[in-house]
């Protein structure tokens, strides 16, 4: 897949066996009721395939039509295939739904590469392995698309979980989660545990596997270890955050922190890679190469194009550095850091590897639209999208892939001054010139 496209993404089996979740190390102070505890019915409700997306089962219409829907925190439309397509096993048939209402309005969403277009309407929507509620939500019925649906991905639509500001055709189209919170008693918060397999999965393994959890309305203790650390949502459009420092194996990249957030930094479950602004990407790759200099890899590997293969079970994880992103904390002059391992940023690739080989793609790539903390980051962590308190929480995921020597980490606090200066202020432009997706 091209690393420049927002989709596809990746998922897979958890690193910890089901039922063997690691215990939490600490307790935080209790918060308002209904937001914490056990959400058994929602745990393990995500599935997916490496590089192609984490999806949740949803039902649409009356009688209910079941569809698999990609979970995407980098967009704000609920859009589903609504016409035959070679890559779709099933699609939303509006004419069969007694509760469908046509909004008599079209929607067109161009990506850097590819696009989808469709017709807007509303219908009744529920999530079988989610809260026991049904909501009337806006739905974009996709009638035409190009390079959007993915052959073999097993999802038929997309659930944009970001804010109305980036909804198409404009911010008057209420996103699904806003509708859910308005129409029910579900708290204005959701959390994601994306579980990378650490190894490629074939189609039958994917269908039988767990890809993680989307907890709607709360936080599940069993899905993380240690403490949750929160960073403010800078602006409610994408889930925008501020990165204040970057380290490779503990070595500061020493760049002006504005560069890390040029022109924004977002948390996006609909992107496979950790994507970095050009200058930051170049500095990071230089530093990663230096840290792993006992080996030399082909140029195409660092571009995310060529695969490097090792004999099965011999991948030298120890020669690759850990990567730490320091995020603005909730307290003035306080930050915390999230640290990922090569097990997150080297993505196992299916179809090419044999029983003799483990093959990987470098899953850090260059961006012209800012930093994107995609699945590469999210697979290390349990991520809480606390919309009610305008913040995003990170804790070490109970399912992240690691080895006996190193583990992903969320640590703090650290003293960091002038963090507000790290944010980049995007010049106001005509909204119609904004491009969905990435350059």
């Amino acid at each position: 897949t091209q690393h420049g496209i927002r989709l596809p993404l990746r998922s897979g089996l958890g690193g910890a066996p089901l039922g063997l979740r690691l215990p939490r190390e600490t307790d935080e102070e209790p918060e308002e009721p209904g937001r914490r505890g056990s959400f058994v019915e929602m745990v393990d409700n995500l599935r997916g395939k490496s590089g192609q997306g984490y999806y949740v089962e949803m039902t649409v219409g009356s009688p209910p039509q079941t569809l698999n829907i990609l979970v995407d925190t980098g967009s704000s439309n609920f859009a589903v295939g609504a016409a035959p397509h070679p890559f779709l096993h099933r699609y939303y048939q509006r004419q069969l739904s007694s509760t469908y209402r046509d909004l008599r309005k079209g929607v067109y969403v161009p990506y850097t590469q590819g696009k989808w277009e469709g017709e807007l309407g509303t219908d009744l929507v529920s999530i079988p392995h989610g809260p026991n509620v049904t909501v009337r939500a806006n739905i974009a019925a996709i009638t035409e698309s190009d390079k959007f649906f993915i052959n073999g991905s097993n999802w038929e639509g997309i659930l944009g979980l970001a804010y109305a500001e980036i909804a198409r055709p404009d911010d008057s189209l209420e996103p699904f989660f806003d509708s859910l919170v308005k129409q029910t008693h579900v708290p204005n918060l959701f959390s994601l545990q994306l579980c990378g397999a650490g190894f490629p999965l074939n189609q039958s393994e994917v269908l039988a596997s767990v890809g993680g959890s989307m907890i709607i309305g709360g936080i599940d203790h069993s899905l993380y270890t240690g403490s949750l650390w929160y960073t403010p949502i800078r602006r409610e459009w994408y889930y925008e955050v501020i990165i204040v420092r970057v380290e490779i194996n503990g070595q500061d990249l020493k760049m002006d922190c504005k560069e890390y957030n040029y022109d924004k930094s977002i948390v996006d479950s609909g992107t496979t890679n950790l994507r970095l602004p050009k200058k930051v990407f170049e500095a990071a790759v230089k530093s990663i190469k230096a840290a792993s200099s006992t080996e030399k890899f082909p140029d195409g590997f660092w571009l995310g194009e060529q695969l490097v293969c090792w004999q099965a079970g011999t991948t030298p994880w120890n020669i690759f550095p850990v990567i730490s992103l320091y995020l603005m904390g909730e307290v003035t002059n306080q930050s915390f850091r999230i640290t990922i391992l090569p097990q997150q940023y080297l993505r196992p690739v299916e179809d090419v590897a044999t029983s003799q080989d483990d093959c990987y793609k470098f899953a850090i790539s260059q961006s012209s639209t800012g930093t994107v903390m995609g699945a590469v980051i999210m697979e290390g962590f349990y991520v809480v999208f606390d919309r009610a308190r305008k913040r995003i929480g990170f804790a070490v995921s109970a399912c992240h892939v690691h080895d006996e020597f190193r583990t992903a980490a969320v640590e703090g606090p650290f003293v960091t001054l002038d963090m507000e200066d790290c944010g980049y202020n995007i010049p106001q432009t005509d909204e119609s010139t904004l491009m969905t997706g990435r350059a």
């Epitope: 006992t294 030399k296 082909p298 195409g300 590997f301 194009e305 695969l307 090419v352």
Partner: antibody, heavy 120, light 108 residues
Framework: QLQLQESGPGLVKPSETLSLTCTVS??????????WGWIRQPPGKGLEWIGM???????WYNPSLKSRVTISVDTSKNQFSLKLSSVTAADTAVYYC????????????WGRGTLVTVSS | EIVLTQSPATLSLSPGERATLSCRAS??????LAWYQQKPGQAPRLLIY???KRATGIPARFSGSGSGTDFTLTISSLEPEDFAVYYC??????????FGGGTKVEIK
């Protein structure tokens, strides 16, 4: 201009170890831009990659030969070497040394090759 | 493992004719494919890399095309010195260990 030259015995007995050396002239083996590799070609057949080495000593081997192959580098002599143990008649081939360039991917410069026959 | 299949096994042509050699990968190798020429008693020589880039000193009559799974080496007008065996090699998966079986271009 850079040249590669293989050297070593042309005849090896079965079960013994085949040893070849490649001498690099007209350039340094310590360049960070290249790996240095071995490829072989049995008479009348196609090309088979054996393995390669970086000046730091990092090695990559063909899994089908890995248990029998050792590639080493001597930067002071601007040479790298191949050892293939427990040889059989199936190891009879022309052995080439080559430079791996163009983004550390392609064999962009080859030695002339040396025929090694395994026979008692 | 990615398998490279070259066709035809032998191509019989006359000098001045156009030669079209095919290399098919069992799955996509993007554009990470090379072509080598080997004359009798000589070492192979790199002709084309990254599917379409000519190596240093290679005449313009040699051209490569294709991406994904299907690749072509074209010799626009065969010279007497072009009669040889041609091999393709993929490096999409690295280290670079996969060669095709070869195509022999012989004088008709």
């Amino acid at each position: 201009q850079l040249q590669l030259q293989e050297s070593g015995p042309g005849l090896v007995k079965p079960s013994e170890t085949l040893s070849l050396t490649c001498t690099v002239s007209g350039g340094s083996i310590s360049s960070s831009s290249y790996y240095w590799g071995w490829i072989r070609q049995p008479p009348g057949k196609g090309l088979e990659w054996i393995g390669m080495i970086y000046y730091s000593g990092s090695t990559w081997y063909n899994p089908s030969l890995k248990s029998r192959v050792t590639i080493s580098v001597d930067t002071s002599k601007n040479q790298f070497s191949l050892k293939l143990s427990s040889v059989t008649a199936a190891d009879t081939a022309v052995y080439y040394c080559a430079r791996v360039g163009h983004g550390i991917s392609y064999f962009d410069l080859w030695g002339r090759g040396t025929l090694v026959t395994v026979s008692s | 493992e990615i398998v490279l299949t070259q066709s035809p096994a032998t191509l019989s042509l006359s000098p001045g004719e156009r030669a079209t050699l095919s290399c098919r990968a069992s799955q996509s190798v993007s554009s990470y494919l090379a072509w080598y020429q080997q004359k009798p008693g000589q070492a192979p020589r790199l002709l084309i890399y990254d599917a379409s880039k000519r190596a240093t000193g290679i005449p313009a009559r040699f051209s490569g095309s294709g991406s994904g799974t299907d690749f072509t080496l074209t010799i626009s007008s065969l010279e007497p010195e072009d009669f040889a065996v041609y091999y393709c090699q993929q490096v999409y998966t690295w280290p670079p260990r996969t060669f095709g079986g070869g195509t022999k271009v012989e004088i008709k």
